[in-house]
């Protein structure tokens, strides 16, 4: 009863003469354990005998021991783990047919048939390709061989056009009850060049001998592979020539469907054949040409062909690195004249005159000068001729004002207080002068551009400079105005003595002045309106108090005279001309007041007085005034006074005081 038995095995096993077979097999019996196992070759059921007949390759004994049997057949299973795996080694062609596994348990019997296909020669593996191979897209190539046996080592090897492939393969071996096979998988990134090539999978034995092989031709889908050809085979042509370009499709799978041509990346209209002809080429047809061919895989673009149309130089133009250019700067001149081939020689012109020694496309003037200004033009020449000279380009050279000078407009000489007019002049300037600057800066009037009016000119306006300015200022050399003025800073200065003047000293006074223009001067000394001398110094051999007073000196030149401030000459002297005066007269009546006054002439004034009587006896009085009150007759006599200052002492002559009796005294007598 088949429902009681469950036997798993591959169904058909493939091998070849001299190889081996390994039959993976497992069983399960529902009712009891397996007691007997017989392996038949091509078993047939004998109805009469009610049993299977055929060649017995293997038979298990009741005790589970294996008989010596055929040595090439091995039962590898056992009853314990329900394994019925067996092997035949070596296997022969006449082993082909059915292997019958007769299985008997206590209650059940079963015959399981396994097909054995042993070929005379090793059968080839089968290469399996993916449905579509496309260039640069990774695919896995599979080589499958429905064979695997533990006792017979084989190897699958990949070849491309007969040469072993460099990519590594993964080899998988299956010896399961589901399937028996050896499979080699090779990851591969086909290129267009592989299209049409033969891939082989070889079966090798342990010694490396090739047993069989399978071959396939690769059908690699790829975009068209293009090359471009030019006729005549030069890509450099002359204006007016004709050129043909051919787009060669070296390979395309599948066949190409569309063709187009591009120039500098832009499609050309109505050009959809593999041949592009350009009649009477013009300069504008120079460029990079390529063809684009598409198939179902995608578009492909050929390499670019650079078509160069040769022509004589065109009308030139000059490019100047900077205009306006600043004097002294570097200026580059470039001659632009489209030509093919590039011009080999250039002729340069400045204001229509040929510039000698300049034959290059560009030249440089390292330090530009004003005379370099003007129109520059050029002519370019190549093998096809000389180009037209263009209109030229203007070079404007800018520079600061040149040769700036200053002129004094008014008649000379200039006197202090005059109005002076100055003008600022220059020889040339680019751009034009737009303002002027003056030094020193003052609140001066600028009645017109470049003219300066200085009103009431000062004595010390010695030098003035002007600058004429455009973008830059150029200064003129300063002009000395040479202003004439009367002597300045006149003063009296005592030269000697260095200390205070004492009567009898030698004294020198100096008449000083700070400046005078002109320098020639005269001196005058004056005291109290009287002229004393005409030298710069006033000398006193022995000064007397009478010389004291207010002194002035005058200095004059051709412009005018200047007086010093009055200078007081002070002479110090000891008290002199002392005299005693009596306010009430020489005669005084007793009992009255007698007042004696010591009068003196002294510088500095007397600070101390002393009184003496006729006996030169010092009196106890120290003031300027001697007051006797009440006066007595005994006071009669001669008196004198002495005055002292810090210079010295002086004394008066004697003066007699007469004190007479009063009527009362007389009356008493």
């Amino acid at each position: 009863d088949s429902s009681k038995w469950n036997i798993e095995h591959p169904g058909t096993i493939y091998a070849w003469e001299g190889a081996c077979v390994w039959v993976p097999c497992t069983y399960r019996v529902l009712d009891g354990a397996l007691e007997t196992f017989i392996l038949f070759h091509n078993p047939e059921y004998n109805q009469n005998m009610s049993k299977f007949e055929g060649t017995r390759l293997y038979e298990s004994t009741k005790d589970g021991k294996l008989p010596s049997g055929q040595k090439r057949v091995q039962f590898l299973g056992n009853k314990i783990n329900n394994n019925c795996t067996l092997s035949i080694h070596p296997v022969h062609v006449n082993d082909s047919g059915q292997l019958g596994l007769r299985m008997v348990s206590k209650t059940e019997k079963w015959m399981e048939r396994i097909h054995l296909n042993v070929s005379e020669r090793p059968f080839p593996p089968r290469i399996q390709l993916p449905p579509k191979l496309q260039e640069s897209q990774e695919v896995t190539l599979t080589c499958l061989l429905n064979f695997s046996c533990y006792g017979y080592q084989i190897q699958l090897q990949w070849l491309l056009e007969g040469v072993p492939m460099r990519q590594a393969a993964v080899t998988l071996t299956s010896l399961s009850t589901k399937s028996v096979f050896t499979r080699s998988e090779l990851k591969f990134s086909p290129q267009w060049s592989h299209h049409g090539k033969i891939v082989t999978c070889e079966l090798h034995d342990v010694d490396g001998k090739v047993l069989s092989e399978d071959m396939v031709q690769l059908n690699v889908k790829h975009t068209p592979k293009l090359t471009i050809e030019v006729t005549p085979n030069e890509t450099t042509v002359r204006k007016g020539d004709s050129v043909t370009m051919t787009c060669k499709v070296n390979s395309s799978n599948p066949e190409y469907t569309t063709v187009s041509w591009l120039k500098d990346g832009i499609p050309l209209k109505e050009q959809n054949t593999l041949m592009l002809t350009l009649h009477k080429v013009t300069k504008s047809q120079s460029g990079r040409y390529c063809c684009r061919v598409s198939n179902d895989v995608g578009p492909a673009t050929s390499e670019k062909v650079f078509l160069q149309v040769q022509y004589a130089p065109e009308s030139s133009r000059v490019q100047i690195s900077q205009s306006p250019a600043v004097e002294g700067s570097e200026v580059n001149f470039l001659c632009i004249s489209p030509a093919n081939p590039l011009p080999t020689n250039y002729t340069w012109y400045h204001n229509g005159k040929e510039v000698q020694g300049r034959t290059e496309k560009q030249f440089q003037i390292q330090k530009i000068l004003p005379w370099h200004a003007g129109t520059y033009s050029c002519e370019a020449e190549n093998i096809l001729g000389i180009g037209e000279r263009g209109p030229g380009t203007e070079l404007d050279v800018q520079y600061p004002p040149k040769k700036v000078t200053m002129v004094i407009e008014n008649p000379t000489p200039i006197r202090e207080g005059d109005t002076v007019t100055l003008s600022c002049n220059y020889s040339s300037s680019n751009p034009i002068v737009n303002h002027y600057e003056w030094r020193p800066r003052g609140a001066w009037e600028e009645p017109s551009l470049g003219v300066l009016k200085i009103q009431n000119i000062g004595w010390n306006n010695t030098a003035v400079a002007c600058a004429a300015c455009n973008n830059w200022c150029s200064w003129a050399s300063p002009v000395t105005l040479n202003v004439l003025y009367a002597p300045r800073g006149v003063r009296v200065r005592k030269i000697k003595p260095l200390s205070e003047i004492h009567s009898g000293n030698s004294v020198s006074l100096q008449c000083d002045f700070s400046s005078s223009h002109p320098k020639e001067v005269q001196f005058f000394w004056e005291k109290n309106g009287s002229l004393l001398g005409k030298e710069s110094q006033l000398n006193f051999d022995s000064i007397s108090p009478e010389d004291a007073g207010s002194y002035s000196c005058w200095v004059n030149n051709s412009i005018g005279q200047t007086a010093s401030k009055a200078w007081t000459l002070e002479v110090l002297y000891a008290p002199r001309r002392l005299r005693v005066s009596m306010s009430q007269g020489n005669q005084v009546m007793e009992g009255k007041t007698a007042t004696l006054i010591c009068e003196s002439d002294a510088n500095p004034p007397v600070y101390s007085y002393a009184w003496f009587d006729w006996n030169n006896q010092s009196l106890p009085y120290s003031g300027r005034m001697l007051r006797l009150e009440p006066v007595k007759v005994q006071h009669s006599g001669a008196y004198w006074c002495q005055g002292t200052n810090r210079v010295g002492k002086g004394h008066s002559p004697l003066i007699t005081l007469t004190v007479y009796y009063s009527p009362q005294t007389i009356g008493r007598r």
């Epitope: 897209q137 990774e138 080592q153 990519q167 590594a168 393969a169 080899t171 591969f188 990134s189």
Partner: antibody
């Protein structure tokens, strides 16, 4: 010129996972395969696995259950992730590239990154 | 997986001598690749596709072999060649390397 540079954590604790990045320059990852190879200190070289230009992978069967290789073509980076590290995974880890897109032989190698598995 | 066995493990030689080291594969490989590695440096490709010299490799290095047996030869040893050399197969995944031959100067 072709360059590969590995960057890794240096130290990994046992049973933890390892992530290494291989940053490449001078070629496109969409065209070339990149392989990972390791070398324990004082020992030989062991191939770990590879990633194809198209993104498919092949691994050393002995490590397949613990390995994962991926990449980011736009960043030119290939990543190796390895789980359940043990001390015998201590090694210098290299990324390498064959000399041609369909060729054998690692013509280009990174300088390697040392990974130490230790508690 | 394909196992690559390199011999000898250590090789001592003098400058100017010819050096040969071998790499044996457990099953056939299409091509063999050879690397040189010096301490502290990344491996450097010497030979690709069995016998082709990688860029910048001196001509004293050469490779040969087929099937399961391959070799690397240095025609005249130089001091700078002291390093460890690894073979590698690229026929079957996983890609595998030999254990290396350490080349020392005597």
């Amino acid at each position: 010129q072709v360059q590969l540079k590995e960057s890794g954590p240096g130290l990994v604790a046992p049973s933890q996972s390892l992530s290494i990045t291989c940053t490449v320059s001078g070629f496109s990852l969409s065209r070339y395969t990149v392989h990972w190879v390791r070398q324990p200190p004082g020992k030989g070289l062991e191939w770990l696995g590879m990633i194809w230009g198209g993104g498919s992978t092949d691994y050393n069967s002995a490590l397949k259950s613990r390995l994962s290789i991926s990449k980011d073509n736009s960043k030119s980076q290939v990543f190796l992730k390895m789980n359940s590290l043990q001390t015998d995974d201590t090694a210098m880890y290299y990324c390498a590239r064959p000399h041609d897109f369909d060729a054998g032989g690692f013509a280009y190698w990174g300088q390697g990154t040392l990974v130490t598995v230790s508690a | 997986q394909i196992v690559l066995t390199q011999s000898p493990a250590i090789l001592s030689t003098s400058p100017g001598e010819k050096v040969t080291m071998t790499c044996s594969a457990s099953s056939r490989v299409n091509y063999m690749y050879w690397y040189q590695q010096k301490p502290g440096s990344s491996p450097r490709l010497l030979i690709y596709d069995t016998s082709n010299l990688a860029s910048g490799v001196p001509v004293r290095f050469s490779g040969s072999g087929s099937g399961t047996s391959y070799s690397l030869t240095i025609s005249r040893m130089e001091a700078e060649d002291a390093a460890t050399y690894y073979c590698q197969q690229w026929t079957s995944y996983p890609l595998t390397f030999g254990a290396g031959t350490k080349l020392e100067l005597k």
